[in-house]
Each structure stands twice: as C-alpha cells, then as structure tokens.
C-alpha cells in the first residue's frame, strides 16, 4: 500500500523564496515520519527534510545546503525554501516515509513540481551550481 | 529597548546537563524566529540552534545533533537551550540571538544577548 | 558548508586611520553576507548585512561591498571604539557560517 503525493505542477519563486505545500493520502498525526524533497528528474538531490516523531517538535535539515523550513499540517507538510537561484529552476518532488507505527509505508512517484526561480537581482557566478553536497 | 538576558550556565561533567534561558524584552518575541550561537574560548562564533517563531520546527548544527534541544515559552517570553551528554568541546559562551526581520528566517543575528559561560570539565 | 575566510588575521593601525577588511567565500552566496563587531568581554553586534546595508543606529564611516565570492568591510576613519575583532556570515546555504575573525588593533 502507497501513499498518494499531490502537489502544484508550478510554482514560480518570487523574491528567491517559494512555498511548496506536499499533501498526502494519509494522517501524519501521532505518526513517526520522514518527509523530504527531492530537486531533478532523478531526485537526485535532496533538498531538505522534516522529521516528525509524533506531536513533538519537528526536526528541520538541509545535507544540502538549501535554506528550508517545514509546516505541519495533518495530512500535509509545507516546505519553505529560501536564497533560491535562478539556476535552482527545476522540478521538485514531495517523498514520505512513515517508520512508525508499523507497517512502514512510503509514496508512490508524485509528478512533482516545477520551480521557475525568478531571481530579483541575484546573479551568481556561472560556476555556482548552487548548494553543493559537502 | 530590545533585550536579551541569558542565564543558567556554569560548571559541569562531562556527560552531564545543562539548560540555559535566554529572557526576551521590548519585542514581540512571538513573532520572531530565535538563534543560539557559541564562542569557545579565545575562537570564533559558530552557530547552534534556531526555532521558529511558534516553537514547533527547530534546526541543529550536526556537532550537537541529537544531544541539544531547543525551544520556547512564548507566553514568558523565553528561549531555552538544553544541552545533554555535554563534552569538552561544547565549553563556550552561549549567546541566544533574535532573527533580524518578524517571520521567517532570515539567519542574520541582531541582537545578541550578552552570553552564558558554559564549563564543561571534569 | 561554506567556509569564510577573513584577512588579514590582525590588523595593526593608528586612529584616523582607513581599515580595509576582507571576507572570502569558498563559493558564491551572492549578496547574502553580514559584517559584524566584537569588543572583549561583550556580544557581537550587527553591522552590515546584506553586503553593503548599514544596520540600525551604525556610523556612516562603517561600509560594506561585494557581491559572490569577495567582500570587503571599510572603516572610512577609525575612531578609538572601533578597536575591536570583525566577523563576518552568510546565509545563503545551510548552515549560516563565519568567518574566523578580523583583529583590528592599535599600532
């Protein structure tokens, strides 16, 4: 059994910042979880992620140098990206894990969601690929 | 006057706890995103901790990870730190710091409290 | 994590003096950089913060530049209070780091 991942097919980041909101086909209340989001076709980066472990405080982390926060809402968890580039323009895909209680159940493949980065005036040096992992 | 006082350091084991406050005045403090950042003796600042402004998501420098623990008291206008399994290396003066803007995170530190002395030492 | 480095460690100069200090990002993080002020025995305090935008109630003789990977702090004339040690940070990946420090000291 899959968890089903809505999320907005695009989003443009004004100001470098962007709300990002992955809505799930199940309750996170009283749930231990890891939500993540991933940036590119292949998810190869991941971008930031939130750890729940039950109603407690959630856990915010980046392995990848992005800027992010993380909402909770009961069936849903908002990602809040910050300092975004324009050269960060890509797609960007919601993933849940639930480790308790058992069974452990993730998400199907979601479409994802494109990211149009509108930079107001931030221009970095072409090298610059954004963050990097370390 | 905005303000910030912390309080609750001092000397402790290695391996042992410590919780530290930091009083918030003359801002709503409910508004705004909170830091701590520490300085070993005679070194640089590096930063620790931060909590969003309602207390329910918090972030964690890998070096304390899974040891610290941050949150709030909004109604007291309170910011706490508690520091488990402490080491040597985690001996610093702990300033707590207010998120520059209301509302989001926007990691620039201002102001400072004026710090806590951390001894961790057996 | 991005590393800052700050040079030079210590710099030696009169009051009245011009103070050039510099920050060295080991990538870009644009505009997003911070200068800040430490005197022994207090907390730092905030200067300068996105690169070039003076905080509130700091003089005119402090100013910021730079942009990407290089920036630069100037105290136009130093005064006696302005013996202190500078940090500097950024913000724009995770974690926000700093450099290691910038003495500047009576000659």
């Known amino acids: 059994n899959k968890i089903l991942v809505k999320q907005s097919p695009m989003l443009v980041a004004y100001d470098n910042a962007v709300n990002l909101s992955c809505k799930y086909s199940y309750n996170l209340f009283s749930r231990e979880f890891r939500a993540s989001l991933h940036k590119g076709l292949d998810s190869a980066v991941e971008v930031c992620v939130v750890y729940g472990n039950y109603s407690q405080q959630l856990q915010v982390y980046s392995k990848t140098g992005f800027n992010c926060d993380g909402k909770l809402g009961n069936e849903s968890v908002t990602f809040y990206l910050q300092n975004l580039y324009v050269n960060q323009t890509d797609i960007y895909f919601c993933k849940i894990e639930v480790m308790y209680p058992p069974p452990y159940l993730d998400n199907e493949k979601s479409n994802g969601t494109i990211i149009h980065v509108k930079g107001k005036h931030l221009c970095p040096s072409p090298l610059f690929p954004g963050p990097s992992k370390p | 006057e905005v303000q910030l006082v912390e309080s609750g350091g001092g000397l402790v084991q290695p391996g042992g706890s410590l919780r530290l406050s930091c009083a918030a005045s003359g801002f709503t403090f409910s508004n705004f995103w909170m830091h701590w950042v520490r300085q070993a003796p005679g070194k640089g600042l590096v930063w620790v901790s931060r909590i969003n402004s309602d207390g329910s998501s918090a972030s964690f420098a890998d070096s304390v990870k899974g040891r610290f623990t941050i949150s709030r008291d909004n109604a007291k206008n309170t910011l706490y730190l508690q520091m488990n399994s402490l080491r040597a290396e985690d001996t610093a003066v702990y300033y707590c710091?207010?998120?520059?803007?209301?509302?989001?995170?926007?990691?620039?530190?201002?102001?400072w409290g004026q710090g806590t002395l951390v001894t961790v030492s057996s | 994590e991005i590393v800052l480095t700050q040079s030079p460690a210590t710099l030696s100069l009169s009051p009245g003096e011009r103070a050039t200090l510099s920050c060295r990002a080991s990538?870009?993080?644009?505009?997003?950089l911070a200068w800040y002020q430490q005197k022994p025995g207090q907390a730092p305090r905030l200067l300068i913060y996105?690169?070039?935008n003076r905080a509130t109630g700091i003089p005119a003789r402090f100013s910021g530049s730079g942009s990407g990977t290089d920036f630069t702090l100037t105290i136009s004339s130093l005064e006696p209070e302005d013996f202190a040690v500078y940090y500097c940070q950024q913000r724009s990946n995770w974690p926000p780091t700093f450099g290691q420090g910038t003495k500047v000291e009576i000659k």
């Open positions: 710091a207010r998120d520059r803007y209301s509302g989001s995170f926007y990691n620039w530190f201002d102001p």
């Open positions: 990538q870009s993080v644009s505009s997003y």
């Open positions: 996105d690169a070039s």
